[in-house]
């Protein structure tokens, strides 16, 4: 790799989870040095014939480039005279997932750190009184889940209950064939009490909040990437 | 110890199909890239196929492309190659060798299996 | 496609000469080569990576160096057991293609 520098310079990754199907970032920073034409910027991925991406000299240098990259990564140009070697990773793909390492070349030395990057998918759940139902039911819905998650209800008035026994869930799988569709829905709902539908995987765990009083209804989501420091 | 152990190799007549199989341990098999290696009789070395750790890419020899498939099951650690179409000039001894860890960084074809002989022929 | 071209395609030799086998790219493989022994009937053997990294086992007298488009293996005192068939390999990103060997005989 045509090494610059002697000495060993401190690089950070941060391990990270990837939307199949939306852009992800793979994030990485190292000590800076002050001239841009000094800096060297990898990318690899464990067990890959090719690069996925390379920085050099102020730009891009894509002739090594693996073929399951071209054209879906980037650095951020501007951000890496400052230190920051992140790799924007387009349309994430299932198989993008592994073990990369940022591999980095200045003047001052080199340096790498890996980092586990996992894939799948994740969304907001949102939860709705069903209207349709004979009696009081909540419906609990999130577009695109992958791998197959699981699905808990709670209750702030009966905390610690069970309640698998009065919950239905089911999967349906989307368009594309790999991410599915989660629909849990929860019986015999009583009013004035907030009750929590958590959504989670190896990935991310997902919770919508809703809150039915005689007056009004109250929704809350909130999202949580797991096993990252994000 | 790393070990390489192919099979499936046999007598097929032209345009039939064969199933190769390469059994691997000795270490973690998806950290690897993997690839086929082909010998025919008295002839030299010829790079057949290649497929990522994880199995997001394929790569392929232009006189095997739109023939050949290789895939790999890193449950069963296992590395195979689907040869379909297959012509006379397709008889050799073919080896799986394991491949890199890290593009630049490390050895490659460091490991190879004791190879399968396929012969085609009417 | 890279093209790897190997000369000589074969040669005699004695124990204790001094061997060198050159291989040239059709384009520029950086220093993406491998060097390879390989024995009758035996699974080919790997000498050199990098176009100058000897493989861990393999004994000092073997050695290769070069980039880009030019390089040699060299086998300083050649041995009764070095007599075999020697290929280089390009692995410049993810293609893979040998060269089309060179056979080591005894003169």
């Known amino acids: 790799f045509g090494i610059s520098g002697r000495h060993s310079i401190t690089v950070t990754t941060v391990a990270s989870a990837g939307n199949i199907g939306e852009d992800g970032i793979l994030s990485c920073t190292f000590e800076p040095d002050i001239k841009l034409s000094d800096i060297v910027i990898q990318w690899l991925k464990e067990g890959v014939l090719g690069l996925v991406h390379e920085f050099k000299e102020g730009k891009d240098e894509l002739s090594e480039q693996d073929e399951m990259f071209r054209g879906r990564t980037a650095v951020f140009a501007d951000q890496v005279i400052v230190g920051n070697a992140s790799l924007r990773l387009k349309n994430v793909q299932l198989t993008d997932a592994g073990t990369y390492k940022c591999y980095i070349i200045t003047s001052k030395g080199k340096g790498n750190a890996n980092l586990e990057y996992k894939t799948g998918a994740f969304s907001m759940p949102e939860v709705n009184v069903d209207y349709n139902a004979s009696s009081e039911t909540l419906r609990c819905e999130a577009p695109r889940w992958f791998p197959q998650p699981t699905v808990v209800w709670a209750s702030q008035v009966d905390q610690g209950a069970n309640f698998s026994e009065v919950s239905n869930t089911s999967f349906e799988l989307n368009s594309e064939n790999v991410t599915m569709k989660v629909v849990s829905v929860l019986y015999n709902v009583t009013i004035n009490n907030t009750y929590s539908c958590m959504i989670e995987n190896d990935i991310a765990k997902a919770t919508g909040d809703i809150k039915v009083t005689e007056s009004e209804i109250k929704r809350r989501s909130h999202l949580q990437l797991l096993n990252s420091k994000a | 110890e790393v070990q390489l152990l192919e099979s499936g190799g046999g007598l097929v007549q032209p345009g039939g199909s064969l199933r190769l199989s390469c059994a691997a341990s000795?270490?973690?098999?998806?950290?690897?890239?993997m690839s086929w290696v082909r010998q025919a009789p008295g002839k030299g070395l010829e790079w057949v196929s290649a497929?990522?750790?994880?199995?997001?890419?394929?790569y392929y020899a232009d006189s095997v492309k739109g023939r050949f498939t290789i895939s790999r099951d890193n449950s069963k650690n296992t590395l195979y190659l689907q040869m379909n179409s297959l012509r006379a000039e397709d008889t050799a001894v073919y080896y799986c060798?394991?491949?890199?860890?890290?593009?630049?960084?490390?050895?490659?074809?460091?490991?190879w299996g004791q190879g399968t002989l396929v012969t085609v022929s009417s | 496609d890279i093209q790897m071209t190997q000369s000589p395609s074969s040669l005699s030799a004695s124990v204790g000469d001094r061997v060198t086998i050159t291989c040239r790219a059709s384009?520029?493989?950086?220093?993406?080569l491998a060097w390879f022994q390989q024995k009758p009937g035996k699974a080919p053997k790997l000498l050199i990576y990098?176009?100058?990294s000897l493989e861990g086992g393999v004994p000092s007298r073997f050695s290769g160096s070069g980039s880009g488009t030019d390089f040699t293996l060299t086998i300083s005192s050649l041995q009764p057991e070095d007599f075999a068939t020697y290929y280089c390999?390009?692995?410049?990103?993810?293609?893979?293609?040998f060269g089309q060997g060179t056979k080591v005989e005894i003169k």
């Open positions: 060798a394991r491949d890199i860890q890290w593009f630049g960084e490390s050895t490659l074809f460091d490991y």
């Open positions: 000795g270490f973690t098999f998806s950290s690897y890239a």
């Open positions: 497929i990522s750790g994880g199995g997001g890419s394929t």
């Open positions: 384009q520029s493989i950086r220093s993406w």
């Open positions: 990098k176009a100058s």
């Open positions: 390999q390009q692995y410049n990103s993810y293609s893979r293609t």
